[in-house]
């Protein structure tokens, strides 16, 4: 069966029907490049005016305008708000009332696209494997990133969150139109990774999405993540304004000027040098969501009532912090280089500025307890990674899970830890799952490109697709079309249940209280320490006059860019992390 031309609110669209075997039978209808909104520079997205005739939706559209890897140029375009749809089809009748999974990509709110990184036309976020294996509709889309998506003056002149509003427009478009493609508009699951996972979290918290989202999955990221909310947007807006020659004293004039500035100049005005900085890399993520009093009306911690009826899976990778650790403490990955106590203390103090010396010392002490017994470089390096993983991913995710559970009415809550080790040959032998390592398995790459993977990788991928799509179908990862290797029990506040995802998932993979000692430390011991820097949100970060252009991560999904270089400024860095 195949859909042919589909009538949407914008007009007719026609994709391609791809047979899954030479013998016929099952197939997948693929639509690429359907417009869901339009947007002017630094303005909220608007409804798309539509078209006449039949739109041939056969090619991915260009990504939203962003800096290239070398950061001396841009790629993508401003006209970028398009989505892609994969609809699995059986032999006879066209699909009807299928669950819908809407993907939000990561990339530090700075880079990325709905199709993801590609190698020889093999796109990372190709929805075919999820759609056909799980019998769900998969939707991916582009949203604005970087300054064009998140620049904000912190007031009504440039409220920011344009990229979040793009995401909302895509979700709302799916709600209104997906029935025509055979989807169930009342069963939409949004899922994402890293900045996309934080976006998923923010979308569930926003009052704008009331009634649109049934379920959500956040992979390595939350609205509560320290890198997910910009508390000092005006500083960064002024930084960009200065670089492009706009006035900075009056936000109205600054906004008006920025809106008529060449979007490529705006994009390139924010550069990410690779050199290690005085502060951890996440402090330099400038263009990210803000609390605008509207789309995000309050601090995310106060918005969990909005998720009371949204089923949620949230989890992290067991070494999510590794990618960040390699930037903040480069010796972590280098066998011939050593990590010193001083290196680690500097990292700790950079993440605990708000609590001053006491905060840094208490944190350093608890994380280095094992060093007396095992002072090996391997143990010290693993500690650095564990610390970054905890601060940036685990603790925010655990707090979010507890908040979700505490506010739940009909909603169910599930937690996981992805522990299938990275396949990167250059990594140390002790390496676990790095940031973004989960993506290839969720998107079924071990099946799509089998020669690059082992049977154990296919086992991981099969299990993840089964759990994810069952959850999308029923709100329970165990119940649906796909058999699962073991029962995944819901998260409870008492036990902190989580599923440990490895190559062999058994009943023993259901575990409890992940890193309980450290969670208690951050939630209790650290939390009660006095804040020493006053209101850390009002402090300004070091100014950046550098023009050095580094190589950011080449994979769209990788969250962390490298911060701006500035050796001349010794100013106090504000804590963007507040536990």
């Amino acid at each position: 069966a195949k859909l042919g031309a589909v009538y949407t609110e914008g007009g007719f669209v026609e994709g391609v029907n791809k047979k899954l075997s030479l013998l016929g039978g099952d197939s997948v209808d693929i639509f690429k490049g359907i417009p869901f909104a339009t947007a002017k520079t630094l303005e909220n997205p608007q409804r798309h005016p539509g078209w006449q005739g039949t739109l041939k939706a056969t090619n991915f559209k260009k990504r939203c305008l962003q800096a290239t890897i070398t950061q001396d140029n841009t790629y993508g375009q401003e006209d970028c708000l398009y989505l892609n749809i994969w609809v699995p089809q059986g032999r006879k009748q066209v699909s009807h009332n299928l669950p819908v999974m809407v993907w939000i990509y990561g990339g530090a709110f700075l880079m990325g696209s709905g199709q993801g990184a590609n190698f020889l036309k093999n796109y990372l976020y190709d929805g075919e494997e999820i759609a056909t294996r799980g019998n769900v509709i998969v939707v991916t889309f582009n949203y604005r990133v970087g300054p064009l998506g998140f620049l904000s003056t912190g007031d009504a002149n440039l409220p920011g969150n344009f990229g979040l509003r793009d995401q909302h427009m895509a979700i709302a478009w799916v709600k209104r139109n997906i029935a025509a493609f055979g989807g169930d508009p009342d069963n939409i699951t949004i899922f994402g990774e890293s900045a996309g996972a934080a976006s998923v979290s923010l979308q569930t918290l926003s009052p704008y999405n009331k009634g649109l989202i049934r379920r959500a999955i956040s992979q390595s990221g939350m609205a509560l993540s320290p890198w997910a909310i910009q508390k000092n947007p005006l500083f960064w807006a002024k930084t960009i304004a200065k670089k492009v020659g706009c006035p900075t004293e009056d936000t109205g004039k600054m906004a008006a000027c920025l809106k008529i500035t060449d979007p490529r100049a705006l994009t390139l005005a924010y550069k990410l040098p690779v050199k290690k900085q005085e502060y951890p890399v996440v402090h330099y993520l400038a263009f990210i969501p803000v609390i605008d009093g509207d789309f995000i009306p309050d601090d995310p911690i106060n918005l969990y009532n909005n998720t009371a009826d949204i089923d949620y899976i949230a989890g992290i990778n067991n070494m999510d912090g590794h990618l960040f650790a390699t930037i903040d403490v480069p010796a972590v990955d280098k066998t011939k280089q050593t990590v010193t106590e001083e290196d680690f203390y500097r990292l700790v103090s950079g993440h605990t500025v708000a609590k001053g010396l006491k905060g840094a010392q208490a944190t350093f002490d608890i994380y280095t307890e094992s060093w007396a017994q095992d002072p090996s470089q391997e143990n010290m390096k693993k500690t650095v990674v564990a610390f970054e993983t905890d601060v940036l991913f685990l603790i925010p995710t655990e707090i979010a899970l507890a908040q979700h559970k505490a506010h739940a009415k009909s909603a169910k809550t599930y937690s996981y830890l992805f522990s299938h080790p990275s396949r990167m040959p250059i990594y140390p032998k002790w390496m676990g799952a790095d940031h973004a390592d989960d993506l290839q398995y969720v998107f079924g790459k071990p099946f799509a490109t089998p020669l690059g993977y082992r049977p154990q990788d296919r086992a991981v991928s099969k299990a993840m697709i089964a759990y994810w799509t069952n959850f999308a179908r029923s709100g329970d990862p165990n119940m649906g079309n796909s058999p699962v290797p073991t029962h995944w029990y819901p998260y409870t506040l008492e036990n902190g249940n989580y599923l440990d995802i490895t190559k062999t998932i058994t009943s023993a993979s259901m575990k409890e209280h992940l890193r309980e000692k450290f969670l208690k430390f951050w939630a209790v011991t650290f939390e009660v320490l006095p804040t020493v820097t006053g209101d850390q949100d009002t402090l300004t970060p070091p100014e950046d006059d550098s023009e050095v252009a580094p190589d950011p991560p080449s994979d769209d999904s990788q969250v962390v860019p490298v911060p701006p270089t500035d050796d001349s400024v010794e100013a106090q860095m504000p804590a963007t992390i507040g536990f």
Epitope: A5, Y7, T8, E14, W51, Q52, A179, A180
Partner: antibody, heavy 119, light 105 residues
Framework: QVQLVQSGAEVKKPGASVKVSCKAS????????MHWVRQAPGQGLEWMGV????????SYNQKFQGRVTMTRDTSTSTVYMELSSLRSEDTAVYYC????????????WGQGTLVTVSS | DIQMTQSPSSLSASVGDRVTITCRAS?????LNWYQQKPGKAPKLLIY???SLASGVPSRFSGSGSGTDFTLTISSLQPEDFATYYC????????FGQGTKLEIK
């Protein structure tokens, strides 16, 4: 100027079929979608479906699926709406209506064709 | 399908009056239009995209709203305005409101 001229009134028996035509002029026929909307006596408007005259693509209201067929003849700039298995509740005025622009409202309407279904 | 509910279903007013008709969608919509229909005639487009005036329509007609709540306002009723008004949502399955009959008081 844009004109949509529909065929004349029809009286049909239950179970029969009716085919209503709508001849377009004053614009490029293949460039705009054509919709069919009906209105039962004293009732409101009900969307039946749409056809793209360019390639013949159609989409029908679920309610009429299997009973309605929309076709077009580009040589005469005419669209047709055929409704089968007629019942008394299909008695209505049937309108063709052209899109205004883009994914826009129904900007131009035919004069309507009364179809009466009676035994 | 999205249900469109108009209120009131009928309304009596006098020439010169200001009249407001509301239309509520059962879920958020992107495209809303207003039509006027006189007895024995085809509907005529008045307002499209919630607030844009169709060509040739007098400026006394205006539309507003977004999401689920929309209004059609006639600032000063003229004798030729007495008719039935319909709202219409344009989606993959378009639907109309049940109509509001505007009569002379």
């Amino acid at each position: 100027q844009v004109q949509l001229v529909q065929s004349g009134a029809e009286v049909k028996k239950p179970g029969a079929s009716v085919k209503v035509s709508c001849k377009a002029s004053g614009y490029t026929f293949t460039s705009y979608n054509m919709h069919w909307v009906r209105q039962a006596p004293g009732q409101g408007l009900e969307w039946m479906g749409v056809i793209n005259p360019g390639d013949g693509a159609t989409s029908y209201n679920q309610k009429f699926q299997g009973r309605v067929t929309m076709t077009r003849d580009t040589s005469t700039s005419t669209v047709y709406m055929e409704l089968s298995s007629l019942r008394s509740e299909d008695t209505a005025v049937y309108y063709c209506a052209r899109d205004y622009y883009g994914s826009s409202p129904l900007g131009y309407w035919g004069q309507g064709t009364l179809v009466t279904v009676s035994s | 399908d999205i249900q469109m509910t108009q209120s009131p279903s009928s309304l009596s007013a006098s020439v010169g009056d200001r009249v407001t008709i509301t239309c509520r969608a059962s879920s958020s919509i992107s495209y809303l239009n207003w039509y006027q229909q006189k007895p024995g005639k085809a509907p005529k487009l008045l307002i499209y995209a919630a607030s844009s005036l169709a060509s040739g329509v007098p400026s006394r007609f205006s539309g507003s709203g977004s999401g689920t709540d929309f209004t059609l306002t006639i600032s000063s009723l003229q004798p030729e305005d007495f008719a039935t008004y319909y709202c219409h949502q344009r989606s993959s399955s378009p639907t109309f409101g049940q109509g509001t009959k505007l009569e002379i008081k």
